[in-house]
């Protein structure tokens, strides 16, 4: 069980011996950031393997990340957020690869929560709401929402709307009457820091008013 | 405890698709390198595919590159096989599971897949 079959381990071209990525996230447990790394190959073997990230510090040089499992994680007050960080994979004292990388640009926002649909009989629409803990937060308050929403049987068919408040609203007829839709959204920072999308939210589910064939229009659930 | 429910096999005909998806819980997903194995009648269990933590990088059996595509959910700490122009000898009872396996590490059910004419 420890390679692949047929003709031994694969080498994937595009995949570097020790490349790895990173991701941070800013006051994501009251004060304190996080830096999570890890290996890009599946089949790098990380037993003796450490992360190290120097400079850009505060008050200290260097700082070794945690394992957890297969990925590689620090929590601390430490980031100073000016200027770039290096970061290495070692091996004991020696290092095998290492990065130069801005935290500020490699952001990965918390995902967003409490996704909820409304239907508006009067004004024949849905609005939806979500909330983001970084309404909160001092550094990365300003973010880019990608809601995606489908009919529930089409497994592939996702519409996708982009928008910087928390808050959209859905026409009710540009949407199938009677029909169960899925809907759920993520976040990417949007002014000054860079980075990544969050996790999509847990999704939601919504059911469209069937037509109400006197009228045209669709009855209210 | 740790858990994992394989689903998506079937019966589909040579150059068909399938897409197995696998449910896990009882670990934190998003920490561990995860990969599908599959098991032919009086074969052993081989390796077919693993995906990294982030779910940036892949590989795979040279048997099914350029055909299938491993990919993850670590929100919903899911993992997906989209197995495109299938073949004979992918026949086949299909496990997901962590990459690095310990002794303890259980199997789930599995999920056949069957490719015939």
């Known amino acids: 069980e420890s390679g692949y079959a047929q003709n031994g381990d694969l080498e994937d071209a595009e995949l570097d011996d020790y490349s790895f990525s990173c991701y941070s996230q800013l006051e994501v447990n009251g004060s304190q950031h996080s830096l999570t790394c890890a290996f890009e190959d599946p089949d790098v073997n990380i037993t003796n393997l450490e992360f190290e990230i120097c400079g850009a510090l505060v008050e200290v040089k260097c700082l070794n990340f945690r394992k957890l499992q297969e990925i590689y994680f620090i929590e601390t007050k430490k980031f100073l957020l000016i200027g770039k960080s290096n970061i290495c994979v070692k091996v004991g004292e020696k290092s095998l690869t290492c990065k130069k990388i801005d935290l500020t640009t490699i952001v990965k926002p918390e995902a967003p929560f409490d996704l909820s649909v409304v239907y508006r009989e009067g004004a024949n629409d849905f609005v939806v709401t979500f909330n983001t803990s970084h309404l909160q937060k001092k550094y990365v308050k300003v973010l880019m929402h990608d809601v995606a929403y489908r009919q529930e049987k089409d497994e592939n068919k996702w519409t996708h709307v982009n928008l910087s408040s928390t808050k959209l609203t859905l026409l009710q007829r540009k949407l199938q009457p009677a029909a169960m839709y899925e809907i759920k959204v993520r976040s990417i920072p949007d002014h000054y820091f860079k980075g990544f999308w969050s996790e999509w939210s847990p999704s939601y589910y919504f059911r469209t008013p069937e037509i109400n064939n006197s009228s045209g229009e669709m009855d209210p659930i | 405890q740790v858990q994992l429910v394989e689903s998506g096999g079937g019966l589909v005909q040579p150059g068909g698709s399938l897409r197995l998806s696998c449910a896990a819980s009882?670990?934190?997903?998003?920490?561990?390198?995860m990969s599908w194995y599959r098991q032919a009648p009086g074969k052993e269990r081989e390796l077919v595919a693993s995906?990294?933590?982030?779910?940036?990088?892949?590989r795979y059996a040279d048997s099914v590159k350029g055909r299938f595509t491993i990919s993850r959910d670590n929100a919903k700490s899911q993992l997906y096989l989209q197995m495109n122009n299938l073949k004979f000898e992918d026949t086949a009872v299909y496990y997901c599971?962590?990459?690095?396996?310990?002794?303890?590490?259980?199997w789930g059910q599995g999920t056949q897949v069957t490719v015939s004419s």
């Open positions: 599971n962590k990459r690095n396996l310990e002794i303890s590490d259980a």
């Open positions: 009882g670990f934190t997903f998003s920490q561990r390198i």
């Open positions: 995906v990294s933590p982030f779910g940036d990088g892949t």
